[in-house]
């Protein structure tokens, strides 16, 4: 029959960040290859990666149609290359993911500090506003456009010569700082997504440090 | 059973429009991707597109691109592939196909005979 | 794009006799398609996935093959039988097909 030797995929895995989304899954196939498809729970299933001998299938272009939808994928193994087959009789095995939210469950990226400008006792942080796959009106859209307000960033700022930390936070990508005349200070930033169960915080960001090319200085 | 039913043949002038229907019963039509390969007189098989019905995702072979367009009717179950510009190089039978079991040009229609005459 | 080239154009043959259908791609492909078309019919699925019989084909058809060589091969030809081949890729966009082998009564 047309499942002659094939296993069903297992461990279907999601790996989301900032909505790029692989649906990854085992195992490497001998003498099989996958397919998969991708619905909304109210959908069609759509097939997509025909026929493949790859363990992972891009299925981002689907998810950025509408990021607050909740996705299900399965994959579908078929018996291929030089094998003994008599047709095809009978369904393919298949596997379900798990149920798949992006704007809940997508993996915040490591945010960066696009650069810090100091004005006298005050600092000003501004967090680089990451593009996305998300699309509207055949335009990109940055992290900020997607999740608005439920998105905000916590900067840890610290003076260079000393080891205590300071948090601020902010619902834009700016911050506005107080420190102290003449003190060179290091900062890292962490994005957060506050009303999430899961994957709520980002990695924090590389230091960046004043004195160094990013940051601008201006005494007044 | 799945069946798809192609619309009648056609004579049509060099640098006109051709509309090639195909009507879908069976199966669920927005589920499956639809494409559509033409053949021309005594000639191999030629992938011209293809369409998602559900959501109207589509692709085509760059070697139509700009003169192709595939449309999809879910409320009627029909599949459109419309080509302009047309030559007499143009003259084939244009065949609607489903995507199946192990193939993604499973099901085909009984194709349409496009002529084109000056 | 994939050129897929199919030998022999045109296939002699009695009943009985075996027959090698040969397509050879330009550059390598992970599996190969091939449709039986009959005059005035549409292709029909024959083999998928380089082996895989498709529904309803007889046993006396086997394909094979790997890279850039695969055939197609009927153990003993019948009557029903006769008819055009295509082989078929989507390794690569765009699918292409190869141009055919007919395989005639002699």
């Known amino acids: 029959s047309g499942t002659t030797n094939t296993v069903a995929a297992y461990n279907l895995t999601w790996k989301s960040t900032n909505f790029k989304t692989i649906l990854e899954w085992e195992p490497k196939p001998v003498n099989q290859v996958y397919t998969v498809q991708i619905s909304t729970k109210s959908g069609d299933w759509k097939s997509k990666c025909f026929y493949t001998t790859d363990t992972e299938c891009d299925l981002t272009d689907e998810i950025v149609k509408d990021v607050k939808q909740t996705y299900l994928a399965r994959v579908f193994s078929y018996p291929a290359g030089n094998v003994e087959s008599t047709g095809s009789a009978g369904e393919p095995l298949y596997e379900n993911s798990p149920e798949f939210t992006p704007y809940l469950e997508t993996n915040l990226g490591q945010p960066t500090i696009q650069s810090f400008e100091q004005v006298g006792t005050k600092v000003n942080v501004t967090v680089e506003d990451e593009r996305t796959l998300v699309r509207r009106n055949n335009t990109f859209l940055s992290l900020r456009d997607v999740f608005g307000k439920d998105l905000i960033y916590t900067l840890y700022y610290w003076k260079s010569s000393s080891s205590g930390k300071k948090t601020a936070k902010t619902n834009t990508n700016e911050f506005l700082i107080d420190v102290d005349k003449g003190e060179n200070y290091c900062f890292s930033v962490q994005a957060v997504i506050p009303s999430r169960t899961v994957n709520r915080k980002s990695t924090d960001s590389p230091v960046e440090c004043m004195g160094q090319e990013k940051g601008e200085f201006r005494e007044i | 059973q799945v069946q798809l039913v192609q619309s009648g043949a056609e004579v049509k002038r060099p640098g006109s429009s051709v509309k090639v229907s195909c009507k879908a019963s069976?199966?669920?039509?927005?589920?499956?991707?639809m494409y559509w390969v033409r053949q021309a007189p005594g000639q191999g098989l030629e992938w011209i597109g293809q369409?998602?019905?559900?959501?109207?995702?589509?692709n085509y072979n760059e070697n139509f691109q700009g003169r192709v367009t595939i449309t999809a009717d879910k409320s009627t179950s029909t599949a459109y592939m419309e080509l302009s510009s047309l030559t007499s190089e143009d003259s084939a039978v244009y065949f609607c196909?489903?995507?199946?079991?192990?193939?993604?040009?499973?099901?085909w229609g009984q194709g349409t005979l496009v002529t084109v005459s000056s | 794009e994939i050129v897929l080239t199919q030998s022999p154009a045109l296939m002699s043959l009695s009943p009985g006799e075996r027959a090698t259908l040969s397509c050879s791609a330009s550059?390598?492909?992970?599996?190969m398609y091939w449709y039986q078309q009959k005059p005035r019919s549409a292709p029909r699925p024959w083999i998928q996935?380089?082996?895989n019989l498709a529904s309803g084909v007889p046993a006396r058809f086997s394909g094979r093959g790997s890279g850039t060589d695969f055939s197609l091969t009927i153990s003993s030809l019948e009557a029903e039988d006769f008819a055009t081949y295509y082989c078929?890729?989507?390794?690569?966009?765009?699918?292409?097909f190869g141009g055919g082998t007919k395989v005639e009564i002699k």
């Open positions: 196909t489903r995507e199946g079991y192990g193939n993604r040009f499973a099901y």
């Open positions: 069976g199966y669920t039509f927005s589920s499956y991707w």
């Open positions: 369409i998602y019905p559900g959501d109207g995702d589509s």
């Open positions: 550059s390598s492909v992970s599996y």
């Open positions: 996935l380089t082996s």
């Open positions: 078929q890729q989507w390794s690569y966009n765009p699918p292409t």
